[in-house]
């Protein structure tokens, strides 16, 4: 009977092992070992045993010891099991962005490693084990599917192999892949909310606000705002899970007409868009024309109001008849019309919305000078020593200068409080003079002496 020791060996790939072959008889006719492995007999042996060193063991092998004794021939095999850790443990790349709520498939490839029966493949989130499977096939491929939530954003996923040869080898051999960081995102199915003027006047500034709620991670979201070909430069305000992009927009005459306002919110590999129509319009203030802005009294004046061809005007609150962009009326200028305002209001409908403009012109009426009995009485009778204020008002545009003189030298103190004396008595010639000419009027002052009272 032939014996071999050790009957089983677990050794690292490329390692060496000493194997003892022995015969049951004292003087075997022959004793040896058959193996394809490089072997070296370790001397000295014994009468019925030999020690061999097998080196560079690359794969599992079963070297055979044989002996030839008088009672017959026999053999025995030792089982050499080679172990080695995988040459490649690799987690397949994760998508650049993974939507929240969608399952993620993790895939790990393992090349090499033996014995396979003792090799386990694990998929990990951080240090938490998600799945544990045995390695099958070459290369071995292991997959698992996990649901993805917001809390998985920034989490590291990896793949680890465990070669467990205990109790034969006290050590547990681990190989871990390079970690992959997951970027998750949540972009709601609702489009952004866009608040903007529906109509915008050329050369005026408008404000556009685009907002969206339920974003994650909000800091990674990008906003694009554009009106036609004009890219807007918004100021973005971030909330917990929301953002608001505010931009000023100024439009030129070239953009007149209907333009598309577009707001796009991009997160991960997805975009949510909202489009809105903005009508760009030009609406100059209406023109108020007077045949002459300055006329003499009695002159006929045509007041005309003209606006945008599609506008409807009202002149001093009276609508054009028929309603349209032009209104006019004729008036004979009177002094009362001096400083009179003529207001033209225009209403333009732009895409169903009403916009308004105003223009006002003032008429100057030249008249006078005038000295009327009402404003410059021809007779005053005052008691002597009483306090009186002589009044005489000249009218006209331009405003006339007024002088009242007695005998060409003594002035009547118009508008001043005076003590009535005998000197005040007499006839005064009041003269109102302007660039338009002069008028005169006699004013008599009578003084009542106390003896007549």
């Amino acid at each position: 009977q032939t014996s071999v020791f050790p009957p089983e060996v677990i050794l690292p790939r490329g390692g060496s092992v000493k194997v003892n072959c022995s015969a049951s008889c004292d003087q075997p006719i022959s004793l040896g070992m058959e193996t394809p492995l490089p072997k070296k007999e370790i001397l000295p042996g014994g009468n019925n045993w030999k020690m061999y060193e097998l080196s560079n063991v690359q794969e599992d092998s079963q070297p055979m010891c044989y002996s030839n004794c008088p009672d017959g021939q026999s053999s025995a095999k030792t089982l050499l099991t080679v172990y080695w850790t995988p040459e490649r443990v690799e987690l397949a790349p994760l998508p650049p962005w993974q939507p929240v709520g969608k399952n993620l498939t993790l895939r790990c490839q393992v090349e090499g490693g033996a014995p396979r029966a003792n090799l386990t493949v694990m998929l990990l989130r951080g240090e938490k084990e998600l799945s544990r499977q045995s390695a099958v096939g070459e290369p071995a491929e292991v997959t698992t599917t996990v649901p993805v939530g917001r809390d998985d954003h920034g989490a590291n996923f990896s793949c680890r192999t465990e070669l467990d040869l205990r109790p034969y080898v006290l050590k547990l051999f681990e190989n871990t892949s390079a970690p992959h960081q997951l970027q998750t995102f949540d972009l709601p199915a609702t489009p952004p909310q866009l608040v903007s003027p529906q109509v915008l006047e050329v050369d005026t500034q408008g404000t556009v606000v685009c907002s969206l709620d339920g974003l994650f991670p909000v800091s990674e979201a990008q906003v694009s705002l554009a009106l036609g070909d004009q890219k807007l430069n918004p100021t973005i305000t971030y909330g917990n899970n929301s953002l608001s992009a505010k931009a000023s927009v100024k439009v030129t005459a070239e953009e007149e007409g209907t333009q598309q306002l577009l707001c796009g919110v991009m997160l991960g590999n997805q975009t949510q868009e909202t489009r809105q129509t903005v009508t760009i319009y030009s609406f100059p203030a209406p023109n108020v024309n007077l045949t002459k802005p300055e006329v003499s009294e009695g002159t006929e004046v045509i007041v005309e109001c003209e606006a945008h061809p599609r506008a409807k005007v009202m002149l001093n609150g009276v609508p054009a008849q028929p309603p349209g962009p032009r209104a006019q009326f004729l008036l004979k200028a009177t002094p009362e019309d001096n400083g009179r305002s003529f207001s033209c209001s225009a209403t333009l409908e732009v895409a169903g919305q009403l916009v308004h403009k105003n223009q006002t012109r003032e008429l100057r009426v030249l008249y006078g000078p005038r000295l009327d009995e009402k404003d410059c009485p021809g007779n005053w009778t005052w008691p002597e020593n009483s306090q009186q204020t002589p009044m005489c008002q000249a009218w006209g545009n331009p405003l006339p200068q007024l002088k009242c003189l007695k005998d060409g030298t003594f002035p009547l103190p118009i508008g001043q409080s005076v003590t009535v004396t005998r000197d005040l008595e007499g006839t005064y010639l009041c003269q109102a003079r302007s660039t338009r000419g002069e008028v005169t009027r006699e004013v008599t002052v009578n003084v009542l002496s106390p003896r007549y009272e």
Epitope: N316, P319, A351
Partner: antibody, heavy 122, light 110 residues
Framework: QSVEESGGRLVTPGTPLTLTCTAS????????MSWVRQAPGKGLEWIGI?????STYYASWAKGRFTISKTSTTVDLKITSPTTEDTATYFC???????????????????WGPGTLVTVSA | GYDMTQTPASVEVAVGGTVTIKCQAS??????LAWFQHKPGQPPKRLIY???TLASGVSSRFKGSGSGTQFTLTISGVESADAATYYC????????????FGGGTEVVVK
């Protein structure tokens, strides 16, 4: 001055129907005209408007479902493909006025017709 | 657009009492607001225009106020004939997709 709707009747779903609003005592070339409806148990709903020059605007829900057009004396509302949800009383209203103090025109439904009933049923 | 939010949706009032109905516009409509009374089987009746001007033939018990975005209709000395649905309506825009009327307020007179 008055407006009156006509053309309301019982129709089957999908059968186009045209309602007519006839204006008396004022010229449609000077006014905007709106169509408004009230479905049973619902509030007043503005459908759309036609301007003095013939431009039309519609409520978002009404776009594609209704067409407004006009002649010199009438304004038409065509229900292109009626559904049971279009069962309602349809009103036409003059929708244009002005304010002398500001000198501005504005939308103002100052004159209404008595309404016409449309019933859509299979 | 100009969304018109009307509150309350329904209100109950005793004869002789006072009712206040509010209407809020999502953007300023200056004073271009009208109030309508609507009874079943009749066309709507315009009560107030330009936010506070009483339409001809309308009782002075109806009063409109407000400007910009906040408007109020007050009915004082309520009568049984005032039982109806009341609507506010903006006169600022009739753009495509516009909201013209508020949601309505049902006034029930006890």
């Amino acid at each position: 001055q008055s407006v009156e709707e006509s053309g309301g009747r019982l129709v089957t779903p999908g059968t186009p129907l045209t309602l007519t609003c006839t204006a008396s005592g004022f010229s449609l070339s000077n006014y905007y005209m709106s169509w408004v409806r009230q479905a049973p148990g619902k509030g007043l709903e503005w459908i759309g408007i036609i301007s003095d020059s013939g431009s039309t605007y519609y409520a978002s829900w009404a776009k594609g479902r209704f067409t407004i057009s006009k002649t010199s004396t009438t304004v038409d509302l065509k229900i292109t493909s009626p559904t049971t949800e279009d069962t309602a009383t349809y009103f036409c209203a003059r929708d244009w006025s002005y304010d002398s103090s500001s000198g501005y025109y504005y939308y103002d439904m100052d004159l209404w017709g008595p309404g016409t009933l449309v019933t859509v049923s299979a | 657009g100009y969304d018109m939010t009307q509150t309350p949706a329904s209100v109950e009032v005793a004869v002789g009492g006072t009712v206040t109905i509010k209407c809020q516009a999502s953007q300023s409509i200056n004073s271009w607001l009208a109030w309508f009374q609507h009874k079943p089987g009749q066309p709507p009746k315009r009560l107030i225009y330009k936010a506070s001007t009483l339409a001809s033939g309308v009782s002075s018990r109806f009063k409109g106020s407000g400007s910009g975005t906040q408007f109020t209709l007050t009915i004082s000395g309520v009568e049984s004939a005032d039982a109806a649905t009341y609507y506010c309506q903006q006169g600022y825009s009739r753009s495509d997709g516009e909201h013209v009327f508020g949601g309505g307020t049902e006034v029930v007179v006890k």
